[in-house]
């Protein structure tokens, strides 16, 4: 079943490679257990960024090796993606996925533009 | 008279404070002397940040304190933005005047973003 | 122990309907999903749909939305899937299966399975 | 959908011999995967969750491992009652679809 996912249409990347945006899902029922996915869609390609599973009310747990981390309230997830570099501008995708109890709800948000800026290197020391 | 502008949506300014863009005017007739002004939107306050007068084939000549730079090619202008933070944040409309010989056309394009991050300072060399 | 019995053979014409049951012994039934399965030997195992027995909550897999009803009944820990217009396509044997952990991320497994339904659509 | 593949349909081994099933999802399912085992006539058996837990009572000569979108079943001393059809399973998005099996058969 569809579900209406709010995220920013744009963020900009700090000098230091972070970006943080909140990913708000209209959830249609009480959902125990949810599951957020950011998705990078750049040149018509979409690779899956990093993914996380938790119970309301509990912590986010990032699986793999995760660039990304989180805190959830209520229905927000607040992301925050590290180590981002210019090449890694894109529009970055918020996918929420209602797992528990039945029924398995589906939203996938419009996207956020991120910026990332290289920053310039620091001078030598002399 | 109205005539058409074209510039980028958006543009990020460089960890340097720098943004270019090319502004570009579907000129209904030979112009020989062409006015552009950069005016900055943001928070529905509309300020000048720039002008410049030239002779079409000459060079732009902004005023010594501008903070813009440009260079002209046929119908195309590019325009470059210095020393811009984080707080410059905002949508620069370009607004080109074919001022001589009659009849005066003006055209004003839709903006473009520019995104500026502060970039974090380097740290001091002991 | 864990128990999942669900009803016997069927043989029944292409156009009809067919219900078939799964009863849960060995555990409190409102606390697991109760999932459905399908076997065929040319599409092999498929993953029909879930039912929450406390809530009602159903999820279908799209494939078969419109073809399978789940439903479940509290008061005899039994589940029922209902097929509606059968074609040959539809001969399979039927799982009911539990999922493991109620609601505990990362646990997602199917541990007691019933012995399977058979259904043979034929006239 | 994704798409589970068991890419080796059968495989013939012989009892005390070591033999490695494999799964590969069409994408990352962070090791949501389970494996089953089915004997002629019966149904699906329980032998590994969360990619490498393996379920009650499963022997030890039984082992899952894998990430991302590569998992593995291994069969360490193949014994008699080992032989039969191997499932894996994934829980990620639904529907949670199954591979095609591999038949294990006695060389």
């Known amino acids: 079943k569809a579900m209406h996912v709010a995220q920013p249409a744009v963020v900009l990347a700090s000098s230091r490679g972070i970006a943080s945006f909140v990913c708000e899902y209209a959830s249609p029922g009480k959902a125990t257990e949810v599951r957020v996915t950011v998705l990078r869609q750049a040149d018509s390609q979409v690779t899956e960024v990093c993914a996380a599973t938790y119970m309301t009310g509990n912590e986010l747990t990032f699986l793999d090796d995760s660039i990304c981390t989180g805190t959830s309230s209520g229905n927000q997830v607040n992301l925050t993606i590290q180590g981002l570099r210019a090449m890694d501008t894109g529009l970055y995708i918020c996918k929420v996925e209602l797992m528990y109890p039945p029924p398995y709800y589906l939203g996938i948000g419009n996207g956020t533009q991120i910026y990332v800026i290289d920053p310039e290197p620091c001078p030598d020391s002399d | 008279k109205a005539m058409h502008v074209a510039q980028p949506a958006v543009v990020l300014a460089s960890s340097r404070g720098i943004a270019s863009f090319v502004c570009e005017y579907a000129s209904p007739g030979k112009a020989t002397e062409v006015r552009v002004t950069v005016l900055r939107q943001a928070d529905s306050q509309v300020t000048e940040v720039c002008a410049a007068t030239y002779m079409t084939g000459n060079e732009l000549t902004f005023l010594d304190d501008s903070i813009c730079t440009g260079t002209s090619s046929g119908n195309q202008v590019n325009l470059t933005i210095q020393g811009l933070r984080a707080m410059d944040t905002g949508l620069y409309i370009c607004k080109v005047e074919l001022m001589y010989p009659p009849p005066y056309y003006l055209g004003i394009g839709n903006g473009t973003q520019i995104y500026v991050i502060d970039p974090e300072p380097c740290p001091d060399s002991d | 122990q864990v128990k999942l019995q669900e009803s016997g053979a069927e043989l029944v014409r292409p156009g009809a309907s067919v219900t078939l049951s799964c009863k849960a012994s060995g555990y409190t039934f409102t606390d697991y999903e109760m999932h459905w399965m399908k076997q065929t030997p040319v599409h092999g195992l498929e993953w029909i749909g879930v039912?929450?027995?406390?809530?009602?909550?159903?999820t279908y897999n799209q494939k078969f939305k419109g073809k399978a009803t789940l439903t479940a009944d509290k008061s005899s820990s039994t589940a029922y899937m209902e097929f509606l217009s059968l074609t040959s396509e539809d001969s399979a044997v039927y799982y009911c299966?539990?999922?493991?952990?109620?609601?505990?991320?990362?646990?997602?497994?199917?541990?007691?399975w019933g012995q399977g339904t058979s259904v043979t659509v034929s006239s | 959908d994704i798409v589970m593949t068991q890419t080796t349909a059968s495989l013939s081994a012989s009892v005390g011999e070591t033999v490695t099933i494999t799964c590969r999802a069409s994408e990352n399912i962070h090791n949501y995967l389970a494996w089953y085992q089915q004997k002629q006539g019966r149904s699906p058996q329980l032998l590994v969750y969360n990619a490498k837990t393996l379920g009650d009572g499963v022997p030890s000569r039984f082992s899952g491992s894998g990430s991302g979108t590569q998992y593995s079943l291994k069969i360490n001393s193949l014994q008699p009652e080992d032989f039969g059809s191997y499932y894996c399973?994934?829980?990620?998005?639904?529907?949670?679809?199954f591979g095609g099996g591999t038949k294990l058969e006695i060389k």
């Open positions: 299966t539990r999922r493991g952990a109620r609601a505990t991320v990362y646990n997602y497994v199917m541990d007691y």
């Open positions: 039912i929450d027995p406390e809530t009602g909550g159903i």
């Open positions: 399973q994934h829980f990620w998005s639904t529907p949670w679809t």
